[in-house]
Interface confidence: low
């Protein structure tokens, strides 16, 4: 059987390296060898490239090497397939070297911002050494922000033969890291070089983008002054790299700018002491290039009635998040401020806050909160410059069993009764919401009994005990994760009724 006619001939000119053609079929049933017939020098010369018939198997590719590679030139290529049964020739194909030339990638040596030109990066590269000198090269520049998965592309051409070339990429984000890579090809060629090594550059810093501003209103002091804790942070959407040198605060009573006071600080929090009237507070951040837009906050008068619109709130846990959702009776409110901090007996060490827009839910990754800690979460409605009444809830991202059980004592011991009282477990030792308490009690050598009561009960009267009997007793506090017993106490019921109370404290 004759070999199949070679088809799908494809040739590529690797500049100053070789001229390679491939074809199909790649495999033949019987051993086949190939000749590639070429005419070059615009048809004046011809030669042959043979596949290596010393290697068994088919080889549907052949390369012509310098010095017979002439450029510019037009080649014709015909492939002959031969086996024991005969020869089969392909159609003659025509190749213009300029159209199939492939060159090395360029080398980017710098990606830098240009002083005073915002949101631009200048890319400098070296043309490939192995590229035709007089050739116009076309380029594709690919770029993306450092944390993005998507490349954007820009195409351009360079006519000159200067080996040090530049391109100015504009309309970028300020103070942002970009990754660049470049490829090139002779203007007429269908084959692009590979991509250059990636290079990173950062756009110039600008004046800060803006601030998010919030406050905590504290109770008025005896002298009538109100402590107001101001806090601010970089606005959502600000460039990741943005840094501020400092912050200017100014504040004044409403309708009386004559009483304006100013403060400069490098902290992101500041305590003001205000009178009972309505105040306005303004904060800007600044760096060496200028100031951010002003962040404004209205502090209501002491006696001002605030609006209430949050009707209900739920906190629920997903696999790796805490989600808080709320319902509102005011459809016009679409901005909310969420505060969260640990519920501890002392002043909370960490206080966090975040603005939510156009949603009635807030989500936080569980790993941003500590397990076994109770968090207070409050949501404030914000309508233009007015802040409404908050709605608060508590949540644990992970509950555990309490670190200690309740401290218990037996009071009012009678003949057949006893009143048990116990103290709430300190917040730091609860490790979860206390669901209930269980009282375990047992007479000496007798059966153990238990009684479970709600978490809001801290006292219980046991009845139907046996007179003049020693009992041991302990109270267990339970969370969703399980329970922990308090210390065991012992008491003995009386043999006859007394009119006065006995207080036994056995620990």
């Amino acid at each position: 059987v004759l070999p199949a006619k070679p088809e799908n001939i494809s040739c590529i000119f690797y500049y100053e390296e070789n001229f390679t053609c491939t074809w199909s079929p790649e495999k033949e049933a019987s051993y086949t060898w190939y000749k590639v017939k070429r005419t070059y020098s615009y048809g004046y010369k011809s030669d042959i490239c043979s596949t290596d018939n010393s290697t068994r198997g088919n080889h549907a590719s052949c390369s012509f090497l310098p010095p017979t590679i002439t450029n510019p030139d037009n080649y014709t290529i015909q492939v002959e397939a031969q086996n024991a049964d005969g020869i089969m020739k392909s159609d003659i194909t025509y190749w213009n070297l300029d159209a199939i030339m492939k060159i090395e990638p360029p080398e980017i040596f710098s990606v830098k911002s240009v002083l005073g030109i915002k949101r631009m990066l200048q890319i400098k590269w070296i043309r490939p050494v192995l590229a035709p000198h007089s050739s116009t090269l076309k380029y594709t520049l690919r770029f993306r922000t450092i944390n993005s998965a998507y490349w954007m592309e820009v195409n351009f051409t360079k006519e000159d033969i200067d080996r040090d070339e530049t391109y100015n990429l504009t309309e970028l984000q300020a103070f942002t890291e970009y990754v660049m890579t470049l490829r090139c090809a002779p203007a007429e060629s269908m084959f692009w070089s590979g991509w250059s090594q990636e290079k990173v550059g950062t756009t110039e810093e600008e004046a800060p983008y803006g601030l998010d501003l919030w406050r905590v209103l504290k109770p008025a002091m005896v002298d009538g002054r109100r402590p107001v804790q101001l806090m601010w942070k970089k606005a959502t959407g600000a460039p990741v790299l943005e840094k501020a040198l400092g912050y200017n605060i100014w504040y004044f009573p409403e309708n009386n700018t004559n009483l304006t006071e100013t403060v400069n600080t490098t902290n992101q929090t500041h305590e003001l002491y205000l009178g009972g009237k309505t105040y306005w507070v303004y904060v800007v951040s600044y760096n060496s290039l200028g100031e951010s837009p002003v962040a404004t906050l209205r502090i209501p008068a002491l006696n001002e009635k605030t609006f209430q619109c949050i009707e209900a709130m739920q906190a629920c846990l997903t696999q790796d998040q805490l989600v808080v959702e709320w319902q509102s009776s005011a459809p016009e409110v679409d901005t909310w401020m969420v505060e969260w901090f640990p519920d501890v007996d002392s002043e909370p060490s960490s206080f966090s806050w975040e603005s939510v827009s156009q949603a009635r839910n807030w989500t936080i990754q569980k790993d941003e909160l500590k397990p076994l800690w109770c968090y207070n979460i409050s949501v404030y409605p914000v309508l233009r410059d007015r802040v409404g009444q908050p709605y608060s809830t508590q949540a644990y991202v992970q509950e555990g069993i309490p670190s200690a059980g309740p401290v218990t004592q037996a009071d009012s011991i009678g003949v057949k009764t006893v009143t048990i009282t116990w103290k709430e477990i300190p917040k730091s030792k609860r490790n979860g919401f206390i669901k209930n308490y269980t009282i375990f009690y047992q007479a000496e050598d007798g059966k153990e009994f238990s009684k479970t009561v709600n978490s809001n009960i801290l006292q219980y009267r046991l009845e139907s005990l046996t007179r003049r009997t020693s009992y041991s007793l302990q109270v267990m506090a339970s969370t969703n994760a399980g329970g922990t017993n308090g210390t065991k106490i012992n008491f003995k019921t009386l043999s006859i009724s007394h009119h006065h109370h006995h207080h036994h404290h056995h620990h």
Epitope: T140, R142, A149, W151, M152, E153, V154, N155, E171
Partner: antibody, heavy 122, light 107 residues
Framework: EVQLVESGGGLVQPGRTLKLFCVAS????????MTWIRQAPGKGLEWVAS????????YYPDSVKGRFTISRDNAKSTLYLQMNSLRSEDTATYYC???????????????WGQGTLVTVSS | DIVMTQSPTSMSISVGDRVTMNCKAS??????VDWYQQKTGQSPKLLIY???NRYTGVPDRFTGSGSGTDFTFTISNMQAEDLAVYYC?????????FGGGTKLELK
């Protein structure tokens, strides 16, 4: 107003070829990646092909790689999908979509055409 | 490729209901999840981008939440015109992938 108008769909036999067209208007075509998404009758959405704003790079899922070719003519604000070696499982409505733009990838598929139905059947 | 698993596949609801559907990504996609609505015989329409941002002109009864691998889409007060199939899509990494859809039907 942004508009994307697809055409070129129809009934075709398995193994044959078909070319879809999408003419864009109302925006600067060469600032945007463009994408073809398809939806088999009664089924969900499947990404088919994307092309970068300059046409320099193209992307395909394995299900169509080697058979479908996405291309564009920025001068004509037109997107193409050349479909070769068609199979019955390619039967679907093919939507032309825009996104993302030069500055980033905030919204992927904001604008969709009305779709063009391709039926592959003998 | 990242697989987006949507649940439930269909729901029977009444006007005024609160409707919640979920989408789970096979790996972390940050907040790069969009939600689309497709009514019968129409092209899909973007409702929510970047997990929780409502697209221009979308009513505020539509909300989205989540990040990482778990995402939720809620219609707080179901209207008759909301009957449609809803799809989630991740755009965090190539290729973009869609969930199988949740179809809303009237009881």
């Amino acid at each position: 107003e942004v508009q994307l108008v697809e055409s070129g769909g129809g009934l075709v036999q398995p193994g044959r070829t078909l070319k879809l067209f999408c003419v864009a208007s109302g925006f600067t075509f060469n600032n945007y990646w463009m994408t073809w998404i398809r939806q088999a009758p009664g089924k969900g959405l499947e990404w088919v092909a994307s092309i970068t704003n300059t046409g320099g790079s193209t992307y395909y899922p394995d299900s169509v790689k080697g058979r479908f070719t996405i291309s564009r003519d920025n001068a004509k604000s037109t997107l193409y999908l050349q479909m070769n070696s068609l199979r019955s499982e390619d039967t679907a409505t093919y939507y032309c979509t825009r996104g993302p733009d030069y500055g980033g990838h905030l919204n992927w598929f904001v604008y969709w055409g009305q779709g063009t139905l391709v039926t592959v059947s003998s | 490729d990242i697989v987006m698993t949507q649940s439930p596949t269909s729901m029977s609801i009444s006007v005024g209901d609160r409707v919640t559907m979920n989408c789970k990504a096979s790996q972390n996609v940050g907040s790069n999840v969009d939600w689309y609505q497709q009514k019968t015989g129409q092209s899909p329409k973007l409702l929510i981008y970047k997990a929780s941002n409502r697209y221009t002109g979308v009513p505020d009864r539509f909300t989205g939440s989540g990040s990482g691998t778990d995402f939720t889409f809620t219609i707080s007060n179901m209207q008759a015109e909301d009957l449609a199939v809803y799809y989630c899509m991740q755009s965090n990494s190539y290729p973009p992938t869609f969930g199988g859809g949740t179809k809303l039907e009237l009881k």
